[in-house]
Interface confidence: medium
């Protein structure tokens, strides 16, 4: 499977909420011995590989924001910790996987990465990630609502797998 990023750029005004989205593509094994670990983190555009470095989102690490569920299940974070930081990640039955950030500030601008790890038999792992940019703007040039820019078909599926 691969991860697609439907939107590569989100431009939002300060104080707005935004939901960043990734989508699982391709066959997803729903066997009882297959589970998915999904999470989010901030990163930088490395020269070698985007999303290599894992930085916290609002002081929460990728471990704090994870979802872990079977292939056929939906899930969302109920962590008080995440919600206290204005964050919530969620996953539905259709392969969509998102993080919602509330009350955006300029400090939230940057590169965001979704990570999906498919775990088979509790030890074999297949890892994929997707990247998108969030720009939070203030002042007269800021949009009144979030504006999203679709990824090109090439960009949305050029996600590394390991």
């Amino acid at each position: 499977f691969k991860v697609a990023t439907p939107y590569s750029l989100y431009v939002c005004p300060e104080g707005q909420n935004v939901t960043l989205t990734c989508r699982l593509l391709g066959p997803v094994d729903k066997g009882h011995d297959v589970t998915f670990y999904k999470t989010w983190y901030r990163s930088s555009r490395g020269e070698v590989q985007t999303c290599s470095e894992r930085r916290p989102i609002r002081n929460l690490t990728f471990q704090d924001l994870h979802l872990h569920h079977g292939g056929h299940q939906a899930a969302n974070t109920s962590h008080d910790l995440a919600q206290r930081h204005g964050l919530e990640s969620a996953s539905d039955h259709h392969g969509n996987f998102s993080i919602t950030m509330r009350n955006l500030t300029l400090l939230d601008s940057g590169l965001y990465c979704c990570l999906v790890v498919e775990i088979r038999h509790h030890h074999s792992e297949h890892r994929v990630h997707g990247a998108m940019e969030l720009q939070v703007q203030t002042g007269k040039d800021a949009p009144s609502n979030c504006v999203v820019y679709p990824s090109s078909s090439q960009d949305s599926e050029n996600i590394t797998a390991a």
Partner: antibody
Framework: QVQLVQSGAEVKKPGASVKISCKAS????????MNWVRQAPGQGLEWIGL????????SYAQKFQGRATLTVDTSTSTAYMELSSLRSEDTAVYYC???????????WGQGTLVTVSS | EIVLTQSPATLSLSPGERVTMSCSAS?????MYWYQQKPGQAPRLLIY???NLASGVPARFSGSGSGTDYTLTISSMEPEDFAVYYC?????????FGQGTKLEIK
């Protein structure tokens, strides 16, 4: 803060079994795998196996298959490793360590010394 | 099973020196991880995903490599860096460690 606290040192006779505990705190126990690694005196690190508290799934290095048993008690956030049919070469420090999927073992217990001697 | 071979086994050096150690895998791995261990202590994660510093690790440590050949570099040795360093792979079951490289004071 994240902590993994292991049970105390053990002295066992050859052929006996030992069960070591590892109590986790400061993080969501079911969001990680709990790994067990051992280190014989003056030697390197050797991975024994892992357990997923999320669903109880286990994996073992072939060397330990059938002799090591990994279990968890999610109600107390405690992982256990039992090693049976002990022999002198099992004398080692045994560590538990947490690992997030797609990551590394970022927190380790303090280690439990198991001495096997007649 | 993927065998990880570290070299050299031991390095004698002085504080301030630059040091490079290698980890060679018997078949290709996606990522390499590095741990530091001091006598009487549990291992400590240094590098994840080949080249990224774990939380709290000084910038004098760096990792690189791909495929079967990986490297850990310390740009300028500090007294607290004298320890044993292990590489480890999660790419293939069973998960294996290298035998370690010991850095000792000259």
């Amino acid at each position: 803060q994240v902590q993994l606290v292991q049970s105390g040192a053990e002295v066992k006779k050859p052929g006996a079994s030992v069960k070591i505990s590892c109590k986790a705190s400061g993080f969501s126990f079911t969001g990680y795998t709990m790994n067990w690694v051992r280190q014989a005196p003056g030697q390197g690190l050797e991975w024994i196996g892992l357990i997923s508290p999320y669903n109880g799934g286990t994996s073992y290095a072939q060397k330990f298959q059938g002799r090591a048993t990994l279990t968890v008690d999610t109600s107390t956030s405690t992982a256990y490793m039992e090693l049976s049919s002990l022999r002198s070469e099992d004398t080692a420090v045994y560590y538990c360590a947490r690992r997030a999927y797609g990551y590394a073992m970022d927190y380790w217990g303090q280690g439990t010394l198991v001495t096997v001697s007649s | 099973e993927i065998v990880l071979t570290q070299s050299p086994a031991t390095l004698s050096l002085s504080p301030g020196e630059r040091v490079t150690m290698s980890c060679s895998a018997s078949s290709s791995v996606s990522y390499m991880y590095w741990y530091q261990q001091k006598p009487g202590q549990a291992p400590r994660l240094l590098i994840y995903d080949t080249s990224n510093l774990a939380s709290g690790v000084p910038a004098r440590f760096s990792g690189s490599g791909s495929g079967t050949d990986y490297t850990l570099t310390i740009s300028s040795m500090e007294p607290e860096d004298f320890a044993v360093y292990y590489c480890q792979q999660w790419s293939s079951y069973p998960f294996t460690f290298g035998q370690g490289t010991k850095l000792e004071i000259k």
